[in-house]
Interface confidence: low
C-alpha cells in the first residue's frame, strides 16, 4: 500500500541487499547509481514502495539535484534483481475476480504543510486538474507530500534523496497482449494449473495476458524481457526452430527492439501464443534535471525530464507522470510554487514506455534555507564617548551569522557577527556622534538570504575636542589679531573659542567668542606676549594652540 | 535594461588557450540558465555550452567537450569560457546569452567577441 | 543528437510578400523549438519561442507553427527591416540551430 511521510515519524521498508559497485553484478539486473552521495542521515531516506502490491526496490540516496542524472554509474551501484511474479497486468480492465486493492488507493491526501502551497503549476506554467493518476492496470504513483520538518541548520541547505525502481515488479513494463479476454473480462492470473477435466487449455487462453519486465542492465546497454508466467515455457521466434527463452526470459535484446516471441508448454494445446515484445530505449538516455532557480529554491520546486540523447523507439509512446501529494502531472516537467522553506518534501516521477511503467524515481527534496527572521527586542545605547552597545535576542528560523552596519553619515561600517552572540560593543566611536545601528540575520544556501534588519540609534556622548587649527598671529605696536579655525573634531554641541593673552605669568586678557578672530588692542609696545588660543564644546575644553608673540617697537617714539 | 558584454577574444596559435568572460547587469544574474553560441565566419549558429543558474548543470556538444569549460561567477555577475587545445575550426564570434527558462533559448544576447585561431 | 533541417537556404522576396520558413526535426521535439532573426554583424534576435509563442516588442507579422518534427516560421506581410538570416533553435534535448535562412530583396 501507498506509504505516508509525517512529520516526526521514520516510515521503514524493507530492502534487499546491496552490492557494492566492485561486486559483480547479478546477471540480470538493472543497475543504477547516484550521481553523488551524501552523509545524510535520519532523512527518510528509505524506498517509496513500488507501484504495485508486490516489490523489491531498490534505494538511490541522494543525488544532487543539478544535473541529477539517476543513471550515470559514477558512484555505489545498486542492482535491482528480478522478483517473483504476482498478479497479471494487462491492459484489460481488470473487472472480475481480483480482488486486490490497488497500491494507488492507498495514500491520496493532500499538500501538506502549508495553506500557501495548493498553487502548483506544470512546466512551463499549465496547471493541472488531474488529482490522481488513473487506477487502471498500470498502478498509480501513490503518495503523500508531507514535509518532514528538520529544523537543524547543520544540514545541507537544498538536497534530494533518489530513490529508482524500474523493472522490479510486476508493474513495469508489462508488455503483455490479450488476444483472448476471458469470458468475465477479468484478467487472467497464471497460477499453477490444477485439472479438473482432462481437456487441456488452448495455450492462447492460458497464457492470454502475460506480464513482460524489461530488465536493463547497464554494463552491456542490454535488455532481458522477462516472462511472468509459473511454468517454464518455450518460446520461438518467427522461425520456430529453436527456444530462445531461458528460465523464461529473452536475453540480450537492444533497445527499441520489436519482435514477435511464440509462447507454448506441454500443458497446453492448440498454436502457440503470440506475443510482442516492445523493448523501450536505454535508461541512461533520460535525465531529471533541477530547474529551480536558485534564489526561489526556498520556496520552488522545479523538476524536469530531458532526453539527453536520441534513440530509435517512438517517442510517442513515452509519456511522463509526476505526482506530488494528490496532485499529478501527466508532462515531463513540474514547477512547485509556494511551498515551506527548510521542509522535505516528495514527489514520484516515472516515465512510461507504451503505457507500461518504465523508470520510476522518487525524490525527496529539502526546499532551501527559508529568509531568516528578524532579531528580536533590539536595544542599543552609548556606553561612553568612543564607545557602544547593541543587544538582542536571536530570530526565529535558521541563521547562520548576524551581519551589524553602523552608519554615521557618511561614513558606513559592517561587521558579521557570529550566530551565538546576543549582545555586541562596539570600540573606536566617534564623540558626540550619532550612530544608526541595523542588525540582520542571514544564511547561506544556494543564494544568501538577508533577513529583514532590526534598528536602532544612539549618540555616543562628548569629549575634549582637538586644538584649534591654523593659527595666525599680526601684530602692531599695541595690538595683536589672532585668527584660527575650527578643530578638526568638535566632540561635542557647537561652543566657544577663548584667547587668554599672559605677559610672564600674568593674565592680562580672556577673551571669547564664536568666531576665531580676535582684536586685542592696549598691548605694551615692544613686549612679549604668550597667546593660548582653544576651543571649549560645551563640555571639555581643548588643548590649547600657544604662540609667543611681541609687539613692535613704538614707530612713534 | 538587460546587457551582456564579452570579453576576452582575440589571435591564439592552434593548440593554444583563450579564456571569455561574460560581464552580466540589468537582471538578477543567478536567476538564469546562461550559454555560449558561437558563429565561424559566414556560417550558421553553433550551441557552445549552457551553465545552470548555480553552476551546478553544464552541458556541451561533443565538439567542444574536454576541451571547453564553461563556469559563472555569481557574485560578479560573470559568465566564463575557458577554451584549451583550440583549432582552427574553433574560430568564431563567440555570443553569450541567457536563456528565458531553464532549457529554453536565449532572449537576451551580448554583442559578441572573435576568437582568431591562426598559425 | 537532434538534427535540423532548414529550408530554404536562402530566398528572395519583395516588402509585402508572405514569406514562409520551415524547420524539420530529426524526431520529435514536442515544440519545443525557437526562431531567431539576424542581421550581419549583430547578435541574434529571438522572435519566436516554443513554436508558436511571440516574444516581448516582435511585431504581430512574425508567427509560428507545428508539432512533432516539423515547424514553420511566416512573416506575413514582409518590410524592409525583415531582410535577415532566420534560425530555428530546438531546446527539448541539449540545442541544435538550423542550417538559417537568409531572407534577400528580389
Known amino acids: 500500500q501507498g506509504s505516508t511521510l509525517s512529520p516526526t515519524g521514520r516510515r521503514t521498508t524493507k530492502m534487499p541487499s546491496v552490492p557494492l559497485s566492485s561486486d559483480p553484478l547479478p546477471t540480470h539486473t538493472t543497475a543504477f547509481s547516484p550521481a553523488s552521495i551524501s552523509e545524510r542521515e535520519n532523512d527518510f531516506s528509505e524506498t517509496t514502495p513500488s507501484l504495485s502490491s508486490d516489490n523489491t526496490s531498490t534505494q538511490v540516496s541522494p543525488d544532487s539535484l543539478d544535473n541529477a542524472s539517476a543513471f550515470n554509474t559514477t558512484g555505489v551501484s545498486s542492482a535491482l534483481t528480478p522478483h517473483l511474479p504476482t498478479h497479471a497486468d494487462s491492459q484489460t480492465p481488470s473487472t472480475g475476480t481480483d480482488t486486490q486493492t490497488p497500491s494507488g488507493s492507498a495514500a491520496n491526501t493532500t499538500l501538506s504543510p502549508t495553506p500557501r502551497s495548493n498553487d502548483i503549476s506544470d512546466v512551463p506554467g499549465e496547471r493541472s486538474t488531474a488529482s490522481t493518476f488513473p487506477t487502471d492496470p498500470i498502478s498509480p504513483l501513490a503518495t503523500t507530500l508531507i514535509p518532514a520538518r528538520n529544523s537543524s541548520a547543520a544540514l545541507p541547505a537544498r538536497t534530494s534523496n533518489t530513490t529508482i525502481t524500474a523493472n522490479t515488479s510486476v508493474s513495469y513494463l508489462n508488455a503483455s497482449e490479450t488476444t483472448t479476454p476471458s469470458p468475465s473480462g477479468s484478467t487472467v492470473i497464471s497460477t499453477p494449473t490444477i485439472a479438473t477435466t482432462t481437456s487441456k487449455p488452448t495455450c492462447a487462453e492460458k497464457y492470454a495476458t502475460i506480464p513482460v519486465d524489461y530488465l536493463y542492465n547497464n554494463k552491456t546497454k542490454l535488455f532481458t524481457a522477462k516472462l511472468n508466467v509459473n511454468e517454464n515455457v518455450e518460446c520461438t521466434n518467427n522461425n520456430h526452430t529453436h527456444n530462445i527463452c531461458t528460465n523464461n526470459e529473452v536475453l540480450n535484446l537492444p533497445e527499441c527492439k520489436e519482435m514477435n516471441v511464440f509462447v507454448s508448454h506441454n500443458s497446453c494445446t492448440d498454436r502457440h501464443k503470440e506475443l510482442k515484445l516492445d523493448v523501450p530505449p536505454e535508461v541512461e538516455k533520460f535525465q531529471l534535471d533541477d530547474c529551480t532557480p536558485d534564489v526561489e529554491a526556498n520556496t520552488t520546486i522545479c523538476l524536469k525530464w530531458k532526453i539527453i540523447e536520441t534513440f530509435a523507439c517512438d517517442k510517442s509512446k513515452i509519456t511522463y507522470r509526476f505526482q506530488c501529494g494528490n496532485k499529478t502531472y501527466n508532462k515531463e516537467g513540474i514547477y512547485l510554487e509556494n511551498l515551506e522553506p527548510e521542509y522535505e518534501y516528495k514527489c514520484d516521477s516515472e516515465i512510461l514506455y507504451n503505457n507500461h511503467k518504465y523508470i520510476n524515481i522518487t525524490k525527496l527534496i529539502k526546499t532551501d534555507f527559508g529568509i531568516p527572521g528578524q532579531p528580536q527586542n533590539v536595544v542599543c545605547r552609548h556606553e561612553d564617548a568612543h564607545q557602544g552597545v547593541i543587544t538582542w535576542n536571536p530570530p526565529q528560523r535558521s541563521f547562520h551569522n548576524f551581519t551589524l552596519c553602523y552608519v554615521n553619515k557618511p561614513a558606513k561600517k559592517c561587521l558579521i557577527l557570529d550566530k551565538h552572540l546576543t549582545t555586541y560593543h562596539l570600540q573606536n566611536l566617534k564623540p558626540y556622534t550619532n550612530y544608526s545601528l541595523s542588525l540582520h540575520a542571514y544564511i547561506i544556501a544556494k543564494v544568501q538570504r538577508n533577513g529583514t534588519a532590526a534598528t536602532c540609534n544612539f549618540t555616543t556622548e562628548s569629549a575634549p575636542p582637538s586644538q584649534v587649527q591654523n593659527m595666525i598671529v599680526s601684530t602692531s605696536d599695541n595690538s595683536m589679531h589672532v585668527k584660527c579655525e575650527v578643530p578638526r573634531d568638535v566632540n561635542g554641541p557647537t561652543g566657544l573659542y577663548h584667547l587668554e593673552v599672559e605677559a610672564g605669568n600674568t593674565l592680562v586678557r580672556n577673551l571669547s567668542q564664536s568666531k576665531c578672530d580676535f582684536s586685542v588692542n592696549n598691548l605694551q609696545y615692544s613686549t612679549y606676549y604668550n597667546l593660548k588660543a582653544y576651543y571649549h564644546n560645551g563640555k571639555y575644553s581643548g588643548e590649547p594652540v600657544i604662540l609667543r608673540e611681541s609687539t613692535s617697537y613704538n614707530s612713534k617714539a | 535594461e538587460v546587457q551582456l558584454v564579452e570579453s576576452g577574444g582575440g589571435l591564439v596559435q592552434p593548440g593554444g588557450s583563450l579564456r571569455l568572460s561574460c560581464a552580466a547587469s540589468?537582471?538578477?544574474?543567478?536567476?538564469?540558465?546562461m550559454t555560449w553560441v558561437r558563429q565561424a565566419p559566414g556560417k550558421g549558429l553553433e550551441w557552445v555550452s549552457s551553465?545552470?543558474?548555480?553552476?551546478?548543470?553544464?552541458y556541451y556538444p561533443d565538439s567542444v567537450k574536454d576541451r571547453f569549460t564553461i563556469s559563472r561567477d555569481n557574485a560578479k555577475n560573470s559568465l566564463y569560457l575557458q577554451m584549451n587545445s583550440l583549432r582552427a575550426e574553433d574560430m568564431a564570434v563567440y555570443y553569450c546569452?541567457?536563456?528565458?527558462?531553464?532549457?529554453?533559448?536565449?532572449?537576451?544576447w551580448g554583442q559578441g567577441t572573435l576568437v582568431t585561431v591562426s598559425s | 543528437g537532434i538534427q535540423m533541417t532548414q529550408s530554404p537556404s536562402s530566398l528572395s522576396a519583395s516588402v509585402g510578400d508572405r514569406v514562409t520558413i520551415t524547420c524539420k526535426a530529426s524526431q520529435d521535439i514536442n515544440k519545443y523549438l525557437d526562431w531567431y532573426q539576424q542581421k550581419p554583424g549583430k547578435a541574434p534576435k529571438l522572435l519566436i519561442y516554443?513554436?508558436?509563442n511571440l516574444h516581448t516588442g516582435i511585431p504581430s507579422r512574425f508567427s509560428g507553427s507545428g508539432s512533432g518534427t516539423d515547424y514553420t516560421l511566416t512573416i506575413s506581410s514582409l518590410q524592409p527591416e525583415d531582410f535577415a538570416t532566420y534560425y530555428c533553435?530546438?531546446?527539448?534535448?541539449?540545442?541544435?540551430f538550423g542550417g538559417g535562412t537568409k531572407v534577400e530583396i528580389k
Open positions: 516554443n513554436t508558436n
Open positions: 540589468g537582471f538578477t544574474f543567478n536567476n538564469y540558465w
Open positions: 546569452a541567457r536563456l528565458y527558462y531553464y532549457d529554453g533559448g536565449g532572449d537576451a
Open positions: 533553435l530546438q531546446h527539448i534535448s541539449r540545442w541544435t
Open positions: 551553465i545552470s543558474s548555480s553552476g551546478g548543470s553544464i
